[in-house]
């Protein structure tokens, strides 16, 4: 379950998955750093079938994927990564 839009919830992810998603099925990734009342980092994945999932930031595969994307950040990324700046 994921609260997609901004609500009074301080954390947007109610439930997190650690199940691997191949990168070709990922549309974009949003990283929400700790803060603004949410005590944990959150990673939200938009998939190409229009569904959305919160991924456990400790899942090895997402850590590997984020590292690969960071290394490629100088080129155009097939999977955009968005970090929300919290006011």
């Amino acid at each position: 379950v994921l609260e997609v839009y901004y609500t009074s919830l301080r954390c947007r992810c109610v439930q997190e998955s650690s199940v691997f998603i191949p990168r070709r099925f990922i549309d974009r990734i949003q990283i929400l750093p700790r803060g603004n009342g949410c005590p944990r980092k959150e990673i939200i994945v938009w998939k190409k079938n229009k569904s959305i999932v919160c991924v456990d930031p400790q899942a090895e595969w997402i850590q590997r994927m984020m590292e690969v994307l960071r290394k490629r950040s100088s080129s155009t990324l097939p999977v955009p990564v968005f970090k929300r700046k919290i006011p």
Partner: antibody, heavy 121, light 106 residues
Framework: EVQLVESGGGLVQPGGSLRLSCAVS????????MAWVRQAPGKGLEWVAS????????YYRDSVKGRFTVSRDNAKNSLYLQMNSLRAEDTAVYYC??????????????WGQGALVTVSS | DIQMTQSPSSLSASVGDRVTITCKAS??????LTWYQQKPGKAPKRLIY???ILQTGVPSRFSGSGSGTEFTLTISSLQPEDFATYFC????????FGQGTKLEIK
């Protein structure tokens, strides 16, 4: 020995329906994403649909969205493709194939022998 | 959608020849490219994945290279069993196959 065996192909009229099955053995089926790929007679390969480990996530090429449904039954080691509102351009050999395992590894490459679907009046 | 342009569409060569097949992607796919071999009436067989990793059991005369948008499959010394059709596949964003290259005996 790894085996994927498709069944359910045949001749169907435009607008009709068909359900393909792929029976799997020789590996842990539930550890793998699975896909359907088709090949029109004398033509190239075309990805049709993919499904994740538990069947909760499915993906389709645009031309089959809303007409085809991919599903799986891990207890029966079987993959399915329900094809509705079939068109002449869906005529092809349909292959089931493995994708990555649960860790994103491409250790295995397994395909079925193919099932011929002919859409014609 | 990512388009894959494969060339040539057909190629005549002799046993012992060195052969190169090219695939161009319409956008950056990094190294997420696979090469398949297909013989008439048979399912495709993966030769190379992640651009240059040889599938277990595939002879070392097959090699792959490239990155970004341009990729090549090279067969260093053609053997009789290599005459077949070859396809590239991008798996950076969903899947797109190249149109295929039919490798025939000269």
């Amino acid at each position: 020995e790894v085996q994927l065996v498709e069944s359910g192909g045949g001749l169907v009229q435009p607008g009709g329906s068909l359900r393909l099955s792929c029976a799997v053995s020789g590996f842990t089926f539930s550890d793998y994403y699975m896909a359907w790929v088709r090949q029109a007679p004398g033509k190239g390969l075309e990805w049709v649909a993919s499904i994740n480990y538990d069947g909760g996530d499915t993906y389709y090429r645009d031309s089959v969205k809303g007409r085809f449904t991919v599903s799986r039954d891990n207890a029966k080691n079987s993959l399915y493709l329900q094809m509705n509102s079939l068109r002449a351009e869906d005529t092809a050999v349909y292959y089931c194939a493995t994708e990555e395992d649960y860790d994103g590894s491409y250790v295995m490459d397994a395909w079925g022998q193919g099932a011929l679907v002919t859409v014609s009046s | 959608d990512i388009q894959m342009t494969q060339s040539p569409s057909s190629l005549s060569a002799s046993v012992g020849d060195r052969v190169t097949i090219t695939c161009k992607a319409s956008q950056n796919i990094n190294k997420e490219l696979t090469w398949y071999q297909q013989k008439p009436g048979k399912a495709p067989k993966r030769l190379i994945y992640n651009t240059n990793i040889l599938q277990t059991g595939v002879p070392s005369r097959f090699s792959g290279s490239g990155s970004g948008t341009e990729f090549t499959l090279t067969i260093s010394s053609l053997q009789p069993e290599d005459f077949a059709t070859y396809f590239c596949l991008q798996q950076s964003s969903l899947y797109t196959f190249g149109q295929g290259t039919k490798l025939e005996i000269k």
